[in-house]
């Protein structure tokens, strides 16, 4: 960022999207602002319009190409600027030399589905979306299960330290409604962070068979 009152944070989804959030104290209310991306070794450049997400923070997505196209590599550096309209000109409000593979945040996992459910266990699978082939198997996952009467924040985190796109949940209560979420993170990148949580998958365990111990 240009100065201390401004915060400019961006993440690369590893394929064709850079998402940015810019926040500033006492920021301009009715001003049009944009993020400009200028790669050091590419012929293209890209712009997105910052839209308010709160009183002093704005966000936008730089769409670099088709969702699954590999638009940047580990050697790329992208100059990212926040530009705000003043009069007829643009003023640089924040700037950073962005190393995409040091600032990764993947898309949330998709296609969650129950593979098999029993009274006490449930096997769930998912897919990763728009993740670079560069990672090969160097990904980790976190999962959480929402039990009745609890909040997501209270749910214990289950860590999968390898690229494993399924989980077998054990010690569940029969005939009970649960929800399940998963998120993904590459092992690469100094400032890399977890993806957003997936959409929750609701499932119900099977009731215990009548006349049998549970």
């Amino acid at each position: 960022a240009v100065n201390g009152t401004s915060q400019f944070t961006c993440f690369y989804n590893s394929r064709a999207n850079i998402s940015c959030v810019w926040s500033q104290d006492g920021a301009l209310q009715d001003t049009s602002c944009q993020v400009h991306a200028w790669p050091d070794r590419r012929r293209w450049n890209q712009t997105c319009e910052l839209l308010p997400v709160s009183q002093a923070s704005w966000a936008c997505n730089l769409i670099l190409g088709a969702p699954d196209s590999q638009k940047l590599t580990t050697v790329d550096i992208v100059t990212l600027r926040v530009l705000c309209r003043e009069g007829v000109r643009w003023r640089v409000m924040a700037i950073q030399d962005f190393k995409p593979f040091e600032n990764l945040r993947l898309m949330a996992p998709i296609s969650l589905q129950v593979v098999h459910v029993e009274t006490h266990r449930c096997n769930i699978s998912w897919e990763i979306s728009q993740a670079s082939h560069y990672f090969e198997r160097h990904l980790e996952f976190e999962a959480r299960t929402l039990s009745p009467g609890h909040t997501w924040e209270e749910a214990p985190l289950l860590t999968l330290k390898q690229k494993q796109e399924w989980i077998c949940l054990e010690t569940l209560t029969p005939d009970t409604q649960y929800e399940f979420q998963v998120r993904v993170k590459p092992l690469q990148g100094e400032f890399t962070t977890w993806s957003p949580w997936s959409q929750p998958l609701a499932f119900r365990t099977k009731p215990a068979a009548l006349g049998k111990d549970t």
Epitope: V2, N3, A27, E86, V88, R89, W90, V92, A94
Partner: antibody, heavy 121, light 112 residues
Framework: EVQLVQSGAEVKKPGASVKVSCKAS????????ISWVRQATGQGLEWMGE????????YYNEMFKGRVTMTRDTSISTAYMELSSLRSEDTAVYYC??????????????WGQGTTVTVSS | DVVMTQSPLSLPVTLGQPASISCRSS???????????LEWYLQRPGQSPRLLIY???NRFSGVPDRFSGSGSGTDFTLKISRVEAEDVGVYYC?????????FGGGTKVEIK
């Protein structure tokens, strides 16, 4: 070599309008802003506003709003500043100046030679 | 609007001697991006203004290193280390941080 060449001196009556031109050369006209600055006789400099020839977008100093109109003709790389309802206080030298479209460093780097406008009955 | 006040109004100097011009703004001219867009322009007799200094202390291309700018917040100074004959003219400070952008009233530098 960057050059901004302005039209010649004008003498106008109070209430009339004047249109000053500024022809740019030596750079891509549509990549930079043209600012207009005036200097009343023996006085300081006053920023009037500016136009971005790339899209014709304008911004006027509140002091001149309603009386000033800035336009451009990209086919001949020329910017225009028209000031209406002239009064004697508008007697001044009017300058055009080039500025970067992104204000990273400075407002104006190259200036025209100035156009003297005299308002007298 | 930000009012820019320069002093002195007139500055008689001896060739080869230093000179200093002050510029004070009516409010802080640090832009919200952290930069201070304070510029100095010189208007030689019968000529158009030309840019000398931008962002308080940066010399524009071709400007001799005898010119230097300093200051912060609301108080700024232009210094000429050794005045030469070609330095004669009116010096204007200018703020580009807050629209409408405004000039100081000017300081006339002349040789004694």
């Amino acid at each position: 070599e960057v050059q901004l060449v302005q039209s010649g001196a004008e003498v106008k009556k109070p209430g009339a309008s004047v249109k000053v031109s500024c022809k740019a050369s030596g750079y891509t006209f549509t990549d930079y802003v043209i600012s207009w600055v005036r200097q009343a006789t023996g006085q300081g400099l006053e920023w009037m506003g500016e136009i971005y020839p790339g899209d014709g977008n304008t911004y006027y100093n509140e002091m001149f709003k309603g009386r000033v109109t800035m336009t451009r003709d990209t086919s001949i790389s020329t910017a225009y500043m028209e000031l209406s309802s002239l009064r004697s206080e508008d007697t001044a030298v009017y300058y055009c100046a080039r500025g970067s479209y992104t204000y990273d460093n400075y407002a104006m780097d190259f200036w025209g030679q100035g156009t003297t406008v005299t308002v007298s009955s | 609007d930000v009012v820019m006040t320069q002093s002195p109004l007139s500055l008689p100097v001896t060739l080869g001697q230093p000179a200093s011009i002050s510029c004070r703004s009516s409010q802080n001219i640090v832009h919200s991006n952290g930069n201070t867009y304070l510029e100095w322009y010189l208007q030689r007799p019968g000529q158009s203004p030309r840019l000398l200094i931008y962002k308080v202390s940066n010399r524009f291309s071709g400007v001799p290193d005898r010119f230097s700018g300093s200051g912060s917040g609301t108080d700024f100074t232009l210094k000429i280390s050794r005045v030469e004959a070609e330095d004669v003219g009116v010096y204007y400070c200018f703020q580009g941080s807050h629209i409408p952008w405004t000039f100081g009233g000017g300081t006339k530098v002349e040789i004694k």
